[in-house]
């Protein structure tokens, strides 16, 4: 078998054997290696020598392999836009963040760049579940057969409505979609100005 | 101004290292430029050695690659040549030599005024 | 690795006169990978001419270098007393780099 090429080596078709790893470098028509993540390109290649590669300084990242001549500068998590962080920077990777609890991405630009108050699902609703917190505005669902929500909240769940009979009590009235059952006790009446309490 | 200046014993016994530095000054030694040696037979052409750059990677010319060591000492600014099992054709004036440091192109815009090594027992 | 051929071995020329030296590649190195430098008796060699014919930092504009492929020509328009000295091109198309033998400018 031929032996592999080590970089710079000529290439007359633009491509190169490893395209994570290599580059094309047009002007001298040599495939190059590119910087690991972490690292920037200290000195650029020619057709007699490779690639050099630096360390990230401090606060400076870049995530993939490639042929930068500078790191990208780490960027806190900014708080007046919504955001908190979840891991901090490294020399291989951006600070990660994320919305803060309430609040939904509102603007996405590759990333989450602005986070806004999620919207209160009114009484008898609640917010449909997401795969992933913080993705997009809450939409609000009603609460299935059985169960109720009785606020106007971003994060209030619709909760099953009491069954009187596990407590030893009966129904005075039916729950709703935006209240729980009333129960009373079965040797008493229930009085028209306590209708949606339970007695005891 | 940038300067260069080489250093070392001016006569080696055959089979022995040749040692020499090279001293750089009114310039990083760390920056993006390779740093080179090149040599000189008496009345004869040039023949570059090798490079160095300050990271430590090394490129030699695959005629010597087998006796030559090159380092770097980013502290004193300098860098270094040694080349092993030296007979009496390695004589010449030793130069090193900055590589210009533009995209792609391996020529040397500074030189040190060069040092005459002997070998001769 | 790449031979570099340099003709004429000596050139005697006087003053005020134009200086044509030629360096020929053993292949092809493209347009870009030439230089040429000067050495005086005692002296290290000074880079005169990169890429082929760029002109380094600090060189009179009577120098000039042109050329491609394998045939390179650098040229003095109008010798100066401080022009003769030695020249020799130099080669970064390929592992190892290479210097042509040289050619001394002599006055005649």
């Known amino acids: 078998s031929q032996p592999q090429a080590v970089p710079p080596y000529a290439s007359e078709n633009q491509t190169c054997r490893d395209q994570e790893k290599e580059y094309y470098e047009p002007q001298h028509r040599i495939c190059c290696s590119r910087c690991p993540p972490g690292t920037y390109v200290s000195a650029k290649c020619s057709r007699i020598r490779d690639t050099v590669c630096a360390t990230c300084a401090e606060n400076s990242y870049n995530e993939h392999w490639n042929y930068l001549t500078i790191c990208q500068l780490c960027r806190p998590c900014d708080p007046v836009m919504g955001l908190e962080e979840i891991a901090p920077c490294t020399s291989k990777r951006k600070t990660q963040c994320r919305c803060q609890p309430g609040m939904f991405c509102a603007a996405w630009a590759l990333e989450c760049t602005h986070c806004e108050l999620l919207s209160d699902c009114p009484p008898g609703t609640e917010a449909e579940l997401k795969d992933e917190v913080g993705k997009g505005n809450n939409h609000c669902v009603p609460c299935k057969a059985g169960h109720f929500q009785n606020t106007s909240s971003p994060s209030a769940r619709c909760q099953p409505h009491t069954r009187c009979e596990n407590q030893g009590l009966v129904e005075a009235a039916p729950g709703t979609a935006q209240s729980d059952t009333t129960c009373k006790n079965p040797l008493e009446p229930l009085p028209p100005e306590m209708s949606g309490t339970m007695l005891m | 101004q940038v300067q260069l200046q080489e250093s070392g014993p001016g006569l080696v016994k055959p089979s022995d290292t040749l040692s020499l530095t090279c001293a750089v000054s009114g310039y990083s030694i760390s920056s993006r430029n390779w740093w080179g040696w090149i040599r000189q037979p008496p009345g004869k052409g040039l023949e570059w050695i090798g490079y160095i750059h300050y990271i430590g990677n090394t490129y030699y010319n695959p005629s010597l690659k087998s006796r030559v060591t090159m380092s770097v000492d980013t502290s004193k600014n300098q860098f270094s040549l040694k080349l092993s099992s030296v007979t009496a054709v390695d004589t010449a004036v030793y130069y090193c030599?900055?590589?210009?440091?533009?995209?792609?192109?391996?020529?040397?815009?500074?030189w040190g005024q060069g040092t005459m090594v002997t070998v001769s027992s | 690795e790449i031979v570099l051929t340099q003709s004429p071995v000596t050139l005697s020329l006087s003053p005020g006169e134009r200086a044509t030296l030629s360096c020929r590649a053993s292949?092809?190195?493209?347009?870009?990978?030439l230089a040429w430098y000067q050495q005086k008796p005692g002296q290290a060699p000074r880079l005169l001419i990169y890429?082929?014919?760029g002109r380094a930092t600090g060189i009179p504009d009577r120098f000039s270098g042109s050329g491609s492929g394998t045939d390179f020509t650098l040229t003095i328009s109008r010798l100066e007393p401080e022009d003769f000295a030695l020249y020799y091109c130099q080669q970064c198309y390929s592992s190892p780099i290479t210097f042509g033998h040289g050619t001394r400018l002599d006055i005649k």
């Open positions: 890429g082929a014919s």
């Open positions: 030599a900055r590589e210009t440091g533009s995209d792609g192109d391996d020529t040397f815009d500074i």
């Open positions: 292949q092809s190195i493209g347009s870009s990978y």
